[in-house]
């Protein structure tokens, strides 16, 4: 069950997809990736207030217990609900290959 | 790829499974659940330092970008990698039913 998409903290403050531009050097990939030289990394960033985009029952429990015991139980966290695949041209022992990665770019986000 | 399980912050400080005892009242379930009266909730709590239990490539990217842009990109977060099912005896319009929930109790944890 994916709960409310209304952010009580104000527009753009809650868990959502952000794009961060990163070079191969930023990612620590320069020694094994040839292309792309720069990646538009999509990632999940933002707060997870009560029931906002709750991924499942566990997220709802976490919200309840965080309210009761904020020092013990953290609030739910904004993480990818699914991913977009991406290819990298990477160096191999003998040359290059084109490799697909299915878990690299966030496609959409939820709180868990 | 699940990376290192050695916690550089000291024993028990990094992302791992914790058990939190919670009553139906704590969980806000008292009006629709009859049993159990108390749940041993397993949840994922702890820090996610560099490459600790990195769930996938996305988590590794997040670590790299958090190091570069800590104010923009959060560190990876400790969340369930899988769940244990649990049954609840719940009230219905006509009486009670036994319902299985697959996404309630964390089974193991990773950083994402």
């Amino acid at each position: 069950a994916r709960n409310g998409d209304h952010c009580p903290l104000g527009p753009g403050r809650c868990c959502r997809l952000h794009t961060v531009r990163a070079s191969l050097e930023d990612l620590g990939w320069a020694d094994w990736v040839l292309s792309p030289r720069e990646v538009q990394v999509t990632m999940c960033i933002g707060a997870c207030p009560s029931q906002f985009r709750a991924a499942n029952m566990h997220a709802q429990i976490k919200t309840s217990l965080h309210r009761l015991k904020p020092d013990t139980v953290p609030a739910p966290c904004c993480v990818p609900a699914s991913y977009n695949p991406m290819v990298l041209i990477q160096k191999t022992d003998t040359g290059v290959s084109l490799q697909t990665y299915d878990d690299l770019l966030a496609k959409d986000c939820h709180c868990i | 790829a699940r990376n290192g399980d050695h916690c550089p912050l000291g024993p028990g400080r990094c992302c791992r499974l914790h058990t939190v005892r919670a009553s139906l009242e704590d969980l806000g379930w008292a009006d629709w659940v009859l049993s159990p009266r108390e749940v041993q909730v397993t949840m994922c709590i702890g820090a996610c330092p560099s490459q600790f239990r990195a769930a996938n490539m996305h988590a590794q990217i997040k670590t790299s970008l958090h190091r570069l842009k800590p104010d923009t990109v959060p560190a990876p977060c400790c969340v369930p990698a899988s769940y244990n099912p649990m049954v609840l005896i719940q009230k219905t319009d006509t009486g009670v039913s036994l319902q299985t929930y697959d996404d309630l109790l964390a089974k193991d944890c990773h950083c994402i």
């Epitope: 292309s35 792309p36 977009n84 695949p85 991406m86 290819v87 041209i89 084109l98 770019l105 | -």
Partner: antibody, heavy 118, light 107 residues
Framework: QVQLQESGPGLVKPSETLSLTCTFS??????????VGWIRQPPGKGLEWIAH???????YFNTALKSRLTISKDTSKNQVSLKLSSVTAADTAVYYC??????????WGQGTLVTVSS | DIVMTQSPATLSTSPGERVTISCKAS??????VAWYQQKPGQSPRFLIY???YRYTGVPDRFSGSGSGTDFTFTISSVQSEDFAVYYC?????????FGGGTKVEIK
Amino acid sequence: QVQLQESGPGLVKPSETLSLTCTFSGFSLSTYGIGVGWIRQPPGKGLEWIAHIWWNNNKYFNTALKSRLTISKDTSKNQVSLKLSSVTAADTAVYYCARMGYDIMDYWGQGTLVTVSS
Amino acid sequence: DIVMTQSPATLSTSPGERVTISCKASQDVNTAVAWYQQKPGQSPRFLIYSSSYRYTGVPDRFSGSGSGTDFTFTISSVQSEDFAVYYCQQHYSTPWTFGGGTKVEIK
């Protein structure tokens, strides 16, 4: 495995529009970094890059042909279409489509011969 | 547009010989040159990426080198299945452009 197949009319009359379709399998045009390109080869001559389209719908065209070209994709059908308007005999060629990963064109279709003649 | 000029247009050789093909770009393309092989009636096969990187599955007798404007493609010991036309292509900037091709034929 990756496969691409070009389809087209075979014969087109001068001044008409040539429509080609590339149907592919083994990869997705929703994957970041993936594109499909078109290349042609007149009989007995060399290769000429025509156009390509990327996963994000960015499009690039051969400078000399740009005004006559249209390229589009249907991600759900795994197809890329190319239209070349106002054809002349000089457009007679084998037309290939190729999978692209950034600037690599690693898998090619078998090609389809298009003859422009009245 | 960047013009790619290949030489020679035809090269006659025997199995076991070393073959070298030259490709010159009309402007600096860094190392962004690829090489393809095409046999009669077949589509081109991708061999070399970014001047010197062999693509997956390409035998190590094929190699490439160069940067800037001057590039070289080498077959260290030609096999019977290597007789074909070879094309260079710049992938530095669009529009991507090919050289005119070099036909490697049996002497």
